[in-house]
C-alpha cells in the first residue's frame, strides 16, 4: 500500500547540456508517465573542490529508492556525479549532499531570481 | 562493508506465525529502500515485500498479502518480516535485500530457511 | 498477473559467447522496467550482475554485459569460463512497488 505519498506534477527543470541536447536550459517540467506509476523530481550535480557544478534536474520515473523523500538528499560519499531525487512539486529546488560517512551536511539553495 | 544478517527463521506448522529480522550494517540504513526475496527448495527468486525509506510505503507479492507484514526500525537498523498464517508453500530460503537507485538489489543477506510442516 | 520469462537452460562453450533474455507477457521490456540480473550458485545468496538494462555492478567482469534485444532484455557472457556456470535471474521493476522475477536460466559451461 502505498501510503501518503506526496503526488509529483512538476519539477525544477536544468541541462548544463542544453545546447548539445538542444533542449531548454532551464525552467519547470511537468511530469509525464504511465497510468498507477509514481512520478519524483531529480538533481545531479558535481563538487569540483567545492565548486557545486549543476548538471542535470528534472522529473524522474518510478523508481522505489524515491519513495517518501520529501527532500532531494544524495548520500554518496564522493561520487563523480552527485544524485538525489525525492517526491513532491518542486522538492528539487534545492538540494542536500549528507554523506554516509558522518561529514559535514552541505544544502545548495538555488540563487534568487531576478525580478522582472 | 554492507553486511545483510537475516535470522528468526525455522520450523513451524502451518497457520503458525514467525519473525523474521535483518540486521543492517556498513550503509546509512535509512537511506534506502528495502526488500525480501524468497526461495523455495529447488525453485526460482521471488519478490516477496519492499518497504520505503521512511516504511510509509509498503509494498507485498499477491500470495502473502494480507499474511506478510513488513516493517522497519531505522534507529536499530533492522529490517523485519512479520509472517502470520504460515502454508507449506511459503517454505524457502528468505532473503532480505537492499535497493538502490534504478530499483535495483545492490546487496544481500545470505539467507534464513523457513519451513512450514506439521 | 505479469509472467517474466527466460529460457530454463542454455549451454555454452568454454571461451565462446551466450545471450540470455528476458521478455514478458504484457508487451516489451524497455529501459523503464530497469531491467537488472543477479547470479546465483547453489547454496549461495544471488550476486548482482547488471542494473539499470546495462550497467555492470561493482567488480564483475567486462565479460558479462547487458541491453535491450527487439523486446526483450539481454545478458551476454562473452569468453564463457567454467565458474559461470550457475543459474541466472532477470528482475524487472514494474513501478508502484512491485518487481517480477524470471524464472530462472540454468546455464551450462561444456567440457
Known amino acids: 500500500s502505498g501510503r501518503g505519498e506526496a503526488e509529483t506534477r512538476e519539477c525544477i527543470y536544468y541541462n548544463a547540456n542544453w545546447e548539445l541536447e538542444r533542449t531548454n536550459q532551464s525552467g519547470l517540467e511537468r511530469c509525464e508517465g504511465e497510468q498507477d506509476k509514481r512520478l519524483h523530481c531529480y538533481a545531479s550535480w558535481r563538487n569540483s573542490s567545492g565548486t557545486i557544478e549543476l548538471v542535470k534536474k528534472g522529473c524522474w520515473l518510478d523508481d522505489f529508492n524515491c519513495y517518501d523523500r520529501q527532500e532531494c538528499v544524495a548520500t554518496e560519499e564522493n561520487p563523480q556525479v552527485y544524485f538525489c531525487c525525492c517526491e513532491g512539486n518542486f522538492c528539487n529546488e534545492r538540494f542536500t549532499h549528507l554523506p554516509e560517512a558522518g561529514g559535514p551536511e552541505v544544502t545548495y539553495e538555488p540563487p534568487p531570481t531576478a525580478p522582472t | 562493508e554492507v553486511q545483510l544478517l537475516e535470522s528468526g527463521g525455522g520450523l513451524v506448522q502451518p497457520g503458525g506465525s514467525l519473525r523474521l529480522s535483518c540486521a543492517a550494517s556498513g550503509f546509512t540504513f535509512r537511506n534506502y529502500a528495502m526488500a525480501w526475496v524468497r526461495q523455495a527448495p529447488g525453485k526460482g527468486l521471488e519478490w516477496v515485500s519492499g518497504i520505503s525509506v521512511t516504511g510509509g510505503s509498503t509494498f507485498y507479492t499477491d500470495s502473502v498479502k494480507g499474511r506478510f507484514t513488513v516493517s522497519r526500525d531505522n534507529s536499530r537498523n533492522t529490517l523485519y518480516l512479520q509472517m502470520n498464517s504460515l502454508r507449506a508453500e511459503d517454505t524457502a530460503v528468505y532473503y532480505c535485500a537492499k535497493v538502490y537507485y534504478t530499483s535495483f538489489f545492490d546487496y544481500w543477506g545470505q539467507g534464513t530457511l523457513v519451513t512450514v510442516s506439521s | 498477473q505479469t509472467v517474466v520469462t527466460q529460457e530454463p537452460s542454455f549451454s555454452v562453450s568454454p571461451g565462446g559467447t551466450v545471450t540470455l533474455t528476458c521478455g514478458f507477457n504484457s508487451g516489451s521490456v524497455s529501459t523503464s522496467y530497469y531491467p537488472s540480473w543477479y547470479q546465483q550458485t547453489p547454496g549461495q545468496a544471488p550476486r548482482t550482475l547488471i542494473y539499470n538494462t546495462n550497467t555492470r555492478s561493482s567488480g564483475v567482469p567486462d565479460r558479462f554485459s547487458g541491453s535491450i534485444l527487439g523486446n526483450k532484455a539481454a545478458l551476454t557472457i562473452t569468453g564463457a569460463q567454467a565458474d559461470d556456470e550457475s543459474d541466472y535471474y532477470c528482475?524487472?521493476?514494474?513501478?508502484?512497488?512491485?518487481?517480477?522475477f524470471g524464472g530462472g536460466t540454468k546455464l551450462t559451461v561444456l567440457g
Open positions: 528482475v524487472l521493476w514494474m513501478g508502484s512497488g512491485i518487481w517480477v
